[in-house]
């Protein structure tokens, strides 16, 4: 009778993570008597996957009833496959022996490759906000995919970006891989509503790429523009001075009025108006009693935005241009939360 051969008909098997892998193996003869074992890898460090004779292998089931003497099908199924299961599997026939079973014949091996989906891309931006015209870096990371081939693209508001660098690790063979990409984005004043998108395409995703996003609202700081204006006279001795704070983001803003360099009032932006581009406008005003002043008054609107150094705008109020009422040094009526009298 011909000597037993161990046949592994599949040179390679490709399985998606989470699925069951079937590793086929048949023998050409019923003799010699002895168990079949399955190993991952070859040589002294090989890993036992299944032993027909003994042991507990909860993830492994046999395709046929291996207890039967006339069985020559030693195929197995391995459940809940993960990338860590990738490797070459060998079906090995042992001859019943003493004191130990003796390896008799091995199959040629079946390479198990595992297709694993990449994790959802995570996009992270700079730790600190930046202002328009500055270039900021965004990173995108995705892990746990196999095989190694993967495509990553960057978009800003639907427009593909070209200034980025991508690495897939490790460089050599591995059970699974990670991708890391850094893109450079130039900020504009209109970017409050903008999004940066990292898109990952992989064979396991069947044409439906994964996306990670970052809102530039978390990254951008648009500094305000200031304008101080003197409104028409409300009453004979009163002047309304306004400070228009325009086009700023984020909302966190503190305004201080200075009279000839001395703090007059400090307030925090509350009831702001939002522009279409996502930036904010705010206005503060003072009701100035000019009769309390003998000299010209320098009014300064000083704004501290989002913890940055203060910016200011001044307005010179010409006292001589207004007649003075004798003894009128009492407070003018305070008609609004943003109004203040200057004595």
């Amino acid at each position: 009778e011909e000597e037993l051969q161990v046949i592994q008909p599949d040179k390679s098997v490709l399985v998606a993570a989470g699925e069951t892998a079937t590793l086929r193996c048949t023998a050409t003869s019923l003799i010699p008597v002895g168990p079949i074992q399955w190993f991952r890898g070859a040589g002294p460090g090989r890993e036992l996957i299944y032993n027909q004779k003994e042991g507990h292998f909860p993830r492994v089931t046999t395709v046929s009833d291996l207890t039967k003497r006339n069985n020559m099908d030693f195929s197995i199924r391995i459940g809940n496959i993960t990338p860590a299961d990738a490797g070459t599997y060998y079906c090995v026939k042992f001859r019943k022996g003493s004191p130990d079973d003796v390896e008799f014949k091995s199959g040629a091996g079946t390479e198990l490759s595992v297709r694993a989906k990449p994790s959802a891309p995570v996009v992270s931006g700079p730790a600190a906000r930046a202002t328009p015209q500055h270039t900021v870096s965004f990173t995108c990371e995705s892990h746990g995919f196999s095989p190694r081939d993967i495509t990553l693209k960057w978009f800003k508001n639907g427009n593909e970006l070209s200034d980025f660098q991508t690495n897939v690790d490790p460089v050599g063979e591995s059970v699974s891989y990670s991708i890391h990409s850094t893109a450079k984005v130039v900020l504009t004043r209109e970017d409050v509503h903008s999004q940066v998108i990292c898109e990952v395409a992989h064979v396991t995703l069947q044409g439906d790429p994964l996306r990670g996003t970052a809102n530039l609202s978390e990254t951008i700081r648009v500094p305000p523009t200031l304008e101080v204006t003197q409104q028409p006279v409300r009453a004979e001795n009163q002047v309304n001075v306004t400070c228009q704070v325009r086009k700023f983001y984020p909302q966190r803003l503190q305004l201080t009025w200075l009279e000839n360099g001395n703090v007059s009032r400090t307030e925090t932006a509350s009831t702001v108006t939002e522009n279409k581009d996502g930036t904010y406008n705010w206005m503060s005003w003072l009701l100035v009693n000019v009769s309390a002043h003998r000299d010209d008054v320098k009014l300064t609107c000083q704004v501290e935005h989002d913890g940055q150094p203060a910016v200011s705008k001044s307005h010179d109020l010409k006292v001589s241009a207004h007649p003075k009422e004798q003894g009128s040094n009492t407070a003018a009526e305070n008609t609004g939360s943003n109004e203040r009298n200057i004595y």
Partner: antibody, heavy 118, light 107 residues
């Protein structure tokens, strides 16, 4: 139904011969190693011989040279030719199938009695 | 030849008891050990093979354990039909050899 049925037992004089048969049914006979086991009255079990799938045979020292095991796959039959019988060979003879992957006996016949006596 | 020694030779127990029979081989038999049950006038019946594998159709109250040279057969809860003689057998090396048997009797 998987079944083994022995026949051919009986009374024989010391030095005489006897041929036992075992008829197999319900399985592919040619795919299994087949064994003979005996048991003297009130005693334990003793393995007597085996014939492998490929026809290879083994015997313990107590019967070697006197007993011959054979098989006829076409007839699903196992045989034990016993020569130079002794009183110590008196026993119930069972055929058994090496039915597990490891040749463990899984199916036994009902046995046939062999008595060697003058 | 490999000698197989069973103990005890006989054992009295009651219905519901848990009993253990041991078998020792004179040399390592690589777990190729079987247990058989035999009732008077009947052929032996396979219970366990490769030391711990339950033969098809045998109830799970029977279990086998051990390795190398020392093995045990345990019956977790004796029923009337379990009272019989039990034999161990090594089938690692020709000639295959049996233990002398353990007679399990009702108390």
């Amino acid at each position: 139904e998987v079944q083994l049925v022995e026949s051919g037992g009986g009374l024989v004089q010391p030095g005489g011969s006897l041929r036992l048969s075992c008829a197999a049914s319900g399985f592919t006979f040619s795919s299994y190693d087949m064994h003979w086991v005996r048991q003297a009255t009130g005693k334990g079990l003793e393995w007597v011989s085996v014939i492998g799938i490929s026809g290879d045979t083994y015997y313990p020292g107590s019967v070697k040279g006197r007993f011959t095991i054979s098989r006829e796959n076409a007839k699903n039959s196992l045989y034990l030719q016993m020569n130079s019988l002794r009183a110590g060979d008196t026993a119930v003879y069972y055929c058994a199938r090496g039915g597990n992957w490891d040749d463990a006996f899984d199916i036994w016949g009902q046995g046939t009695m062999v008595t060697v006596s003058s | 030849d490999i000698q197989m020694t069973q103990s005890p030779s006989s054992l009295s127990a009651s219905v519901g008891d848990r009993v253990t029979i041991t078998c020792r081989a004179s040399q390592d038999i690589n777990n190729y050990l079987a247990w058989f049950q035999q009732k008077p006038g009947k052929a032996p019946k396979s219970q366990i093979y490769t030391a711990s594998s339950l033969q098809s159709g045998v109830p799970s109250k029977f279990s086998g354990s051990g390795s190398g040279t020392d093995f045990t057969l345990t019956i977790s809860s004796l029923q009337p039909e379990d009272f019989a003689t039990y034999y161990c057998q090594q089938y690692n090396t020709y000639p295959y050899t049996f233990g002398q048997g353990t007679k399990l009797e009702i108390k």
